[in-house]
């Protein structure tokens, strides 16, 4: 595949990455799948600077990111190491809360209205952000 040199239409470029901000809501798994079909992934926040950028674009709205602990440990969807990486949880979060009564705890992370992170039920239909790296080879065949 060829290396992507500019962002697709309706995507926002920032620091060698492209971001797409949804205006509708989906469950975390559906949002994850949507991004994958776009040859991207749910946003992975690696710095305070990136956090501020995303926060500015989503506003005070619950929005899924690419972080979950459905398989045990917290994991970023692109393999970025959770333990050594940037974190911005709300105070007392994550808490794997069971009080929602929907079954199970809370395994998916989202931006809250103030931008800080919370874990929530993965089935909730929140907005989401896709990210893809400009330096990444695209899946499209090169133009001859």
């Amino acid at each position: 595949g060829s290396e992507r040199t500019c962002c697709p239409v309706n995507w926002v470029e920032h620091e060698r990455s492209c971001y797409w901000f949804s205006r509708s809501g989906k469950a975390w798994a559906d949002a994850d799948n949507y991004c994958r079909l776009e040859d991207a992934h749910l946003v992975v926040v690696t710095s305070w600077e990136e956090q501020k950028f995303v926060q500015h674009h989503i506003g005070p709205v619950n929005t899924w990111m690419g972080l979950h602990d459905q398989n045990g440990p917290w994991k970023w969807v692109d393999g970025t190491d959770y333990e050594t990486g940037f974190k911005n949880w709300r105070p007392e979060q994550p808490d794997d809360w069971y009080g929602h009564g929907l079954g199970g705890g809370e395994d998916c992370a989202h931006f809250t209205d103030d931008g800080r992170w919370n874990d929530d039920v993965c089935q909730r239909p929140y907005r989401w952000v896709c990210e893809t790296e400009l330096d990444k080879a695209s899946q499209e065949p090169p133009l001859l």
Partner: antibody, heavy 115, light 107 residues
Framework: QVQLVQSGAEVKKPGASVKVSCKAS????????INWVRQATGQGLEWMGW????????GYVQKFQGRVTMTRNTSISTAYMELSSLRSEDTAVYYC????????WGQGTLVTVSS | DIQLTQSPSSLSASVGDRVTITCRAS??????LNWYQQKPGKAPELLIY???NLQSGVPSRFSGSGSGTDFTLTISTLQPEDFVTYYC?????????FGGGTKVEIK
């Protein structure tokens, strides 16, 4: 690698209290709850409750309410489970586990209650 | 509280056998059923979470299935190290509860 290391075996008299520690390493202590499970000799597993290391919030099984206290010291990534008013039926191995779906467990602490 | 009934409580089998253990919940627990293996004198180890997901490092001869109230753990080809005790656990609602255990013994 993720490890939960528990304190050593204890022998207590009926009516006394015991405090078991569980030191976590290899992960961010505040990102996962700590659960306590006990097992009497030759018996099954019995969940006692959970603690959120971030907030200190806890949830106890009704059977242990009023006798159990779960606490933590985040500066040393250690969780504690204290059980008071001990009786002979409390003789068991006590385990700490990470998450309610216990993906990692401590090695267990044998608490013997005997006069 | 949700009760879990595991059956059988013990079974005898031989190396190479296919073994199935069942776990029945007193109410629907969706997919929130986990299986543990416990060796004598050791802490339990998570085998399968959320009904059918194999925990990292667990051999593929272990599998889980089911939904709602009825669940099964299958060991496709018993190995010598598999002759230990197995527990189911529900993490659908608090308090978390365990089944009574199934001891797999050598015939």
């Amino acid at each position: 690698q993720v490890q939960l290391v528990q304190s050593g075996a204890e022998v207590k008299k009926p009516g006394a209290s015991v405090k078991v520690s569980c030191k976590a390493s290899g992960y961010t202590f505040t990102s996962y709850d700590i659960n306590w499970v006990r097992q009497a000799t030759g018996q099954g597993l019995e969940w006692m409750g959970w603690m959120n290391p971030n907030s200190g919030n806890t949830g106890y099984v009704q059977k242990f309410q009023g006798r159990v206290t779960m606490t933590r010291n985040t500066s040393i990534s250690t969780a504690y489970m204290e059980l008071s008013s001990l009786r002979s039926e409390d003789t068991a191995v006590y385990y700490c586990a990470r998450k309610k779906t216990g993906d990692y467990w401590g090695q267990g602490t044998l608490v013997t209650v005997s006069s | 509280d949700i009760q879990l009934t595991q059956s059988p409580s013990s079974l005898s089998a031989s190396v190479g056998d296919r073994v199935t253990i069942t776990c029945r919940a007193s109410q629907s627990i969706s997919k929130y059923l986990n299986w543990y293996q416990q060796k004598p004198g050791k802490a339990p180890e998570l085998l399968i979470y959320a009904t059918s997901n194999l925990q990292s490092g667990v051999p593929s001869r272990f599998s889980g299935s089911g939904s709602g109230t009825d669940f099964t753990l299958t060991i496709s080809t018993l190995q010598p190290e598999d002759f230990v005790t197995y527990y189911c656990q529900q993490s659908y609602s608090l308090p978390v509860t365990f089944g009574g255990g199934t001891k797999v013994e050598i015939k």
